[in-house]
């Protein structure tokens, strides 16, 4: 006997109680493919999650994070607390970036400033907790007689500019 369930479209399930008739997925459930014998329970966007898109008969709900949090993982499986720029999230909460590191986003970790000298360049703008250093011309370009449209800033070690 041919399996009649294969004829059931997405959004339905094959109801064995009704001689393999395709029944619509009940509210708060879905089936994203045809031929299913059960419908999956819809995801609930509660707590730190908010609804981006409702659950339909053929697709699961899509969640986002409430203000002050951001998504992590596939399909926003977790919400992580935002921090300010110049901070990173630790087990003890949001902490300022250590000297010599920066974070220009509300998420992620503090990263070391660029070492301009590794590229043979000098520091044009100092780094801060929120911003990386800006590298300028190489020291060789600063030698007398070198043509430059604007006078370069003197080379110095990266450091915090006044906050």
């Amino acid at each position: 006997l041919q399996d009649l369930c294969s004829n059931c479209p997405a959004g339905t399930f094959c109801d064995n109680n009704r001689s393999q008739i395709c029944s619509p997925c009940p509210p708060n459930s879905f089936s994203s493919a045809g031929g299913q014998r059960t419908c999956d329970i819809c995801r609930q966007c509660k707590g730190v999650f908010k609804t981006r898109k409702e659950c339909s008969s053929t697709s699961n709900a899509e969640c986002d994070c409430i203000s002050g949090y951001h998504c992590l993982g596939a399909e926003c499986s977790m919400c992580e607390q935002d921090c300010k720029q110049g901070q990173e999230l630790t087990k003890k909460g949001c902490k300022d970036c250590c000297f010599g590191t920066f974070n220009d986003q509300k998420r992620g970790i503090c990263r070391p400033w660029t070492n301009c000298s590794l590229d043979g360049k000098s520091v044009l703008v100092n780094g801060t907790k929120e911003r990386d250093v800006v590298c300028g011309p190489s020291p060789a370009d600063l030698s007398p007689g070198a043509s430059s449209a604007t006078p370069p800033a003197p080379a110095r070690e990266p450091g915090h500019s006044p906050q």
């Epitope: 959004g11 029944s23 509210p27 089936s31």
Partner: antibody, heavy 115, light 112 residues
Framework: QSVEESGGRLVTPGTPLTLTCTVS????????MIWVRQAPGEGLQYIGF?????YTYYTNWAKGRFTISRTSTTVDLKMTSLTAADTATYFC????????????WGPGTLVTVSS | DVVMTQTPASVSEPVRATVTIKCQAS??????LAWYQQKPGQPPKLLIY???TLASGVPSRFSGSGSGTEFTLTISDLECADAATYYC??????????????FGGGTEVVFK
């Protein structure tokens, strides 16, 4: 639990208009809040909704000219570049069971666009 | 766009008869279909959603079936109070946050 629309009136073509939906007995932020319209003697037209996550969705013809927003107790429908074709009764409704199916409807408010 | 074609446009039946109204979607919408009843001068009333789920307070004389592109509303044991226009409506999400939550053209139920 109830829903009621207000702000419908006679306007001239091109005039912007904002309709307000006031609810009682439930929290707006927990539901899809939907706008639907019906021209005199015609069928129903779905405009769009704002969901419980504060996201807005619009039908293709409404996108750009209609804007749905909400406060804690009201839902607004802002309409721009109105023409005679926008003459209709505008309904506000609450979605049923976490969906964008209009379940609880207001009585509607009539907007007439005429010069 | 998703086009919802409703048939018939009008139906005339005696009291206690059974009325069947059909709704066809231009593409598969799973089971994302609702039925509404509207009487003159009143807002629509939700009867059925998710193709077959009866809304709160709706008599069991109303039933919905179908999936994919073909859907049916059945009103059995017709009463005078059922004289109204009936609409189907789909839920369908497109891209770029555009929705195709289209209503059918309506079916008027009158009595012989």
């Amino acid at each position: 639990q109830s829903v009621e629309e207000s702000g419908g009136r006679l306007v001239t073509p091109g005039t912007p208009l904002t309709l307000t939906c006031t609810v009682s007995g439930f929290t707006i932020s927990s539901h899809h809040m939907i706008w639907v319209r019906q021209a005199p003697g015609e069928g129903l037209q779905y405009i769009g909704f704002i969901n419980d996550g504060d996201y807005t969705y619009y039908t293709n013809w409404a996108k750009g000219r209609f804007t749905i927003s909400r406060t804690s107790t009201t839902v607004d429908l802002k309409m721009t570049s109105l023409t005679a074709a926008d003459t209709a009764t505008y309904f506000c409704a609450r979605g049923v069971d976490g969906t964008s199916y209009p379940g609880l409807w207001g009585p509607g408010t009539l907007v007439t666009v005429s010069s | 766009d998703v086009v919802m074609t409703q048939t018939p446009a009008s139906v005339s039946e005696p009291v206690r008869a059974t009325v069947t109204i059909k709704c066809q979607a231009s593409q598969s919408i799973g089971a994302d279909l609702a039925w509404y009843q509207q009487k003159p001068g009143q807002p629509p009333k939700l009867l059925i959603y998710r193709a077959s789920t009866l809304a709160s307070g709706v008599p069991s004389r109303f039933s919905g079936s179908g999936s994919g592109t073909e859907f049916t509303l059945t009103i059995s044991d017709l009463e005078c109070a059922d004289a109204a226009t009936y609409y189907c409506q789909c839920i369908y999400y497109g891209t770029d946050d555009v929705i195709y939550h289209t209503f059918g053209g309506g079916t008027e139920v009158v009595f012989k």
